[in-house]
Amino acid sequence: MMTGTIETTGNISAKKGGSVILQCHLSSTMAQVTQVNWEQHDHSLLAIRNAELGWHIYPAFKDRVAPGPGLGLTLQSLTMNDTGEYFCTYHTYPDGTYRGRIFLEVLESSVAEHSARFQIP
C-alpha cells in the first residue's frame, strides 16, 4: 500500500535571468527511492537522479540546470519560456511511483520576489 505523500514548493515565481530551486520531498513512507525524475511542462526530461548512477542532466538543459540541493533541481538563467508546470516523479520500492507538481512563473519585473511555500498537491 502506498502511504507516502509528496510535498512540493507549490506555486513559485522568480525573476527573468535569475535562478530558482525546484524541490519535492517524499514523506510518510519507508520505501526505498530508486530514482527521481524531473520533467518540464512539455514532458521533456530535465534531469534524473538515480540511486546508483547519480545525476544525469539531459543535454538540452546542461547549461541551465544544476543538480540539487538534495534531490531537488536548480534552474538558472530563467527565460519567460520557462514559465509552466514542472513534475518530480519518485520511483520507489515497494510502493511504486509518486508524482509531484510545481508551477513556476517567470516574471519580467525586476522587483519580482521569489516566493515559495510547501504544500501537498
Epitope: 530508486t34 526530461l45 538515480n50 546508483e52 544525469h56 516523479t89 520500492y93 511504486g96 511511483t97
Partner: antibody, heavy 119, light 107 residues
Framework: EVQLVESGGVLVKPGGSLKLSCAAS????????MSWVRQTPEKRLEWVAT????????YYPDSVKGRFTISRDNAKNILYLQMSSLRSEDTALYYC????????????WGQGTSVTVSS | DIQMTQTTSSLSASLGDRVTITCRAS??????LNWYQQKPDGTVKLLIY???RLHSGVPSRFSGSGSGTDYSLTISNLEQEDIATYFC?????????FGGGTKVEIK
C-alpha cells in the same frame, strides 16, 4: 540497434532448477534497469523480477520471491534469472526487458525463451 | 494487487477503421499506464507510456488517453501491420500488472 537475446529455457521437472540468460547489445547495459516478464500458456503477461542498473537492488512479486533470483554481469552485458523450486505454474515464455531511463515503461523486449515445468 | 481489465479479448475491424481498445484499473493509477503490442510471432513492442506519450518510432496513428482508472488506446487508421494483441500495464504500484490483452483481427 538494441538487442536482447534470451537462452536457457528447457523442459524441467517440478522442484527442479534452471538459469536463464539474456545477452544484451546495442546500448550501454550498465545504465539500464532490466526485468524479466513471463507469458503464461494462457497468454497472460506477468512481471517476474527487476534489477537496478548497478545490481544493488532487486525486486520480485510474491509469486516468485524466495525461489527466483535476478542478477547481472555488467562487464559481460548479461542478465540472468536463477529459478529454483520450480512449479507447473512457472511454465511460460520468459522475456528479458529493458526499462526506459525514465523508468516509466519497458521499451525493449527480447524474443523470449520457453520454460516448461512438467513431470 | 491492482487488477487490470481489458473487457474486449478480441475484435474484428476493417483496414482503415478507427479502433479503440480500453483498459480499466481496479484503483486510480495516476496515468502510469503503458500499452504494448505483441505480434503473432511473439515480438513485443512498447507503443505508448504514461497514458499518452508515443514511444520513439511508433506511428502517429497510435494514440492513448485516459485518467484515474479508465484508459484507452486508439488506432486511427488500421493497417495490416497492426494485426496483433495489445496489452495495457500499470506502473503505479508494485507488483506491476498487465491486462489480459485485446487481439485485433481483420474483418
Amino acid at each position: 540497434e538494441v538487442q536482447l537475446v534470451e537462452s536457457g529455457g528447457v523442459l524441467v521437472k517440478p522442484g527442479g532448477s534452471l538459469k536463464l540468460s539474456c545477452a544484451a547489445s546495442g546500448f550501454t547495459f550498465s545504465n539500464y534497469v532490466m526485468s524479466w516478464v513471463r507469458q503464461t500458456p494462457e497468454k497472460r503477461l506477468e512481471w517476474v523480477a527487476t534489477i537496478t542498473s548497478g545490481g544493488t537492488y532487486t525486486y520480485y512479486p510474491d509469486s516468485v520471491k524466495g525461489r527466483f533470483t535476478i542478477s547481472r554481469d555488467n562487464a559481460k552485458n548479461i542478465l540472468y534469472l536463477q529459478m529454483s523450486s520450480l512449479r507447473s505454474e512457472d511454465t511460460a515464455l520468459y522475456y528479458c526487458t529493458r526499462w526506459l531511463l525514465s523508468l516509466y515503461a519497458m521499451d525493449y523486449w527480447g524474443q523470449g525463451t520457453s520454460v516448461t515445468v512438467s513431470s | 494487487d491492482i487488477q487490470m481489465t481489458q473487457t474486449t479479448s478480441s475484435l474484428s475491424a476493417s483496414l482503415g477503421d478507427r479502433v479503440t481498445i480500453t483498459c480499466r484499473a481496479s484503483q486510480d493509477i495516476s496515468n502510469f499506464l503503458n500499452w504494448y503490442q505483441q505480434k503473432p510471432d511473439g515480438t513485443v513492442k512498447l507503443l505508448i507510456y504514461y497514458t499518452s506519450r508515443l514511444h520513439s518510432g511508433v506511428p502517429s496513428r497510435f494514440s492513448g488517453s485516459g485518467s484515474g482508472t479508465d484508459y484507452s488506446l486508439t488506432i486511427s487508421n488500421l493497417e495490416q501491420e497492426d494485426i496483433a494483441t495489445y496489452f495495457c500495464q500499470q506502473g503505479k504500484t508494485y507488483p506491476y500488472t498487465f491486462g489480459g490483452g485485446t487481439k485485433v483481427e481483420i474483418k
